[in-house]
Interface confidence: medium
């Protein structure tokens, strides 16, 4: 093993090129200067190094930069990024969006790996907030990214970034996340006219309070059932039959198919049967005529 530590005569690498793929692992270790590797990282990605050879190259960089790689190296890691552990990445200081994009490209088309999650976390923390360009980039690579954040993390998203969000980016968000995002969206889209505003805000309505749903019902928005079914139950319950009818417009007929599912089921239980009958949909389960409706939540609030 001792003689393997010295680079064989004539094998010292003067540049990173295809000839190195024929080097054994120990030869790479002995014959490739780490500083040369760092300055020519952009070439590594074009050369078909094997998995084992990539391990050697990573080891050389680790020795050269024990405190973490500089961004000039990180940006050109390419497939070598896949050899990095979250612990390696936590040592990095990534500030350039171009660097982030270059590394996300390597992982493109696949689920978010622990490496990528750590990289994004480092990047966002370094920036202090999820600005629009960053959010644009992250949701382009990972449509579900936004919904992977905690409500606390989402609170750092500035309203201006909401413009980058597409409906599919919110598909997996839960009500707690939409509660945080909705006020930001409302603020971001506040200067739009009625119909354009509804198109933009629609995906965020799972976080909307009752008063906003009431306001929307006055604007002939024709909300579809899929959106209605994602509304907060507590926001839907206080709506009157007339308000729901206006909110849904021609889509009101879809209530019948959803009468056993929340929030429709719970809303039906809160309406007078007489009022439900005016819809002509055969919805059953409302409060029979002559019964007094006590709003216990209101009563508790008053006491």
């Amino acid at each position: 093993e001792v003689e393997k530590t010295a680079c064989p005569s004539g094998k010292k690498a003067r540049e990173i090129d295809e000839s190195l793929i024929f080097y054994k692992k120990w030869e790479l270790e002995a014959c490739v200067d780490a500083a040369l590797l760092a300055t020519q990282m952009d070439r590594v990605n074009a050369i078909p190094f094997t998995y084992e050879q990539l391990d050697v190259l990573k080891h050389k960089l680790d020795e050269l930069y024990p405190q973490g790689y500089p961004e000039s190296v990180i940006q050109h890691l390419g497939y070598l990024f896949l050899k990095m552990s979250p612990e390696d990445i936590r040592k990095w200081n990534v500030t350039s969006l171009e660097t982030l994009k270059a590394l996300l490209e390597v992982n493109k088309g696949h689920e978010m790996s622990p490496q990528v999650a750590t990289l994004i976390d480092r990047f966002v923390k370094g920036r202090g907030q999820l600005d629009k360009d960053t959010l644009d980039t992250l949701t382009a690579f990972y449509p579900g990214y936004l919904c992977s954040l905690s409500p606390e993390e989402l609170s750092s998203v500035p309203p201006s970034s909401i413009w980058a969000v597409r409906p599919q980016d919110l598909d997996t968000c839960d009500p707690r996340q939409l509660d945080v995002l909705y006020p930001k969206a409302r603020l971001a889209f506040q200067n739009m006219n009625g119909s354009e505003y509804f198109v933009k805000i629609q995906s965020f309505l799972g976080g909307a309070p009752t008063e906003d749903l009431k306001a929307l019902s006055q604007q002939n928005v024709s909300m579809d059932l899929a959106t209605f079914m994602k509304l907060r139950t507590d926001a839907v319950l206080p709506l009157t039959v007339a308000e729901v009818q206006k909110l849904l417009g021609p889509h009101v007929e879809g209530l019948k198919a959803e009468e056993r599912h929340r929030p429709v089921r719970d809303w039906i239980l809160r309406q007078r049967q007489d009022d439900l009958d005016t819809l002509g949909l055969g919805l059953q389960g409302g409060i029979p005529n002559g019964y007094l409706v006590l709003d216990l939540s209101m009563q508790e609030a008053l006491s």
């Epitope: 295809e18 793929i21 024929f22 054994k24 692992k25 074009a46 050369i47 078909p48 094997t50 998995y51 084992e52 050879q53 497939y79 896949l82 390597v106 992982n107 493109k108 088309g109 696949h110």
Partner: antibody, heavy 124, light 106 residues
């Protein structure tokens, strides 16, 4: 259907030249590393050369370096092997092979699609 | 170059029997790949990354091993399994193939 079809083989004298072609279909040719692998009569398989998607990286087995040239035309979905200074030991069936697209897109270590092969005979 | 030695060179078995094919590398490799070649046909990928079945390959085929010793097993031979089998490595350049094991009907 994913398919590779080789052509251009034949009988050639020692020192002569031949150009093999491989027509690819049924997949996005421009995304894959491609290789040539040969099989001498009654013998095993031997990797000859490979080329990356944009032709910026080319590798040869030492015994053919300087004599063979691999190239590709992504617009035509075609792979080529120009063989010069042919020797008797180059006699073989030449296969065009696709290098598998692995998880994360990194080039893998195997050939996942093979052509039917074209026969090259070097003899006087 | 990494030399791959396959054994046995020829294996004579009957349909329904279990076949065990061996491949030994001259130095340690991370993964082994297996290809099947029938007479006058091109090779076909069977196993990748040591133990993963390629698309469309029957589950009677399996691969195992690590370091320098790898095995291809066919649990119950079917008539169409009689062919030549090659192991292949790409842990270092150039990629190399074993000399092949011919599986013939007894």
């Amino acid at each position: 259907e994913v398919q590779l079809v080789e052509s251009g083989g034949g009988l050639v004298q020692p020192g002569g030249s031949l150009k093999l072609s491989c027509a690819a279909s049924g997949f996005d040719f421009s995304r894959y590393w491609m290789s040539w692998v040969r099989q001498a009569p009654g013998k095993g398989l031997e990797w000859v050369s490979e080329i990356n998607p944009d032709s910026s990286t080319i590798v040869y087995t030492p015994s053919v370096k300087g004599r063979f040239t691999i190239s590709r035309d992504n617009a035509k979905n075609s792979l080529y092997l120009q063989m010069n200074s042919l020797r008797a030991e180059d006699t073989a069936v030449y296969y065009c092979a696709r290098r598998g697209s692995h998880y994360y897109g990194y080039r893998t270590g195997y050939f996942d699609v093979w052509g039917a092969g074209t026969t090259v005979t070097v003899s006087s | 170059d990494v030399v791959l030695t396959q054994s046995p060179a020829t294996l004579s078995l009957s349909p329904g029997e279990r076949a065990t094919l061996s491949c030994r590398a001259s130095s340690s490799v991370s993964y082994m790949y297996w290809h099947q070649q029938k007479p006058d046909q091109s090779p076909k990928l069977l196993i990748y990354d040591t133990s993963n079945l390629a698309s469309g390959v029957p589950v009677r085929f399996s691969g195992s091993g690590s370091g320098t010793d790898y095995t291809l097993t066919i649990s119950s031979l079917e008539p169409e399994d009689f062919a030549v089998y090659y192991c292949q490595q790409w842990s270092s350049y150039p990629p190399t193939f074993g000399g092949g094991t011919k599986l013939e009907i007894k």
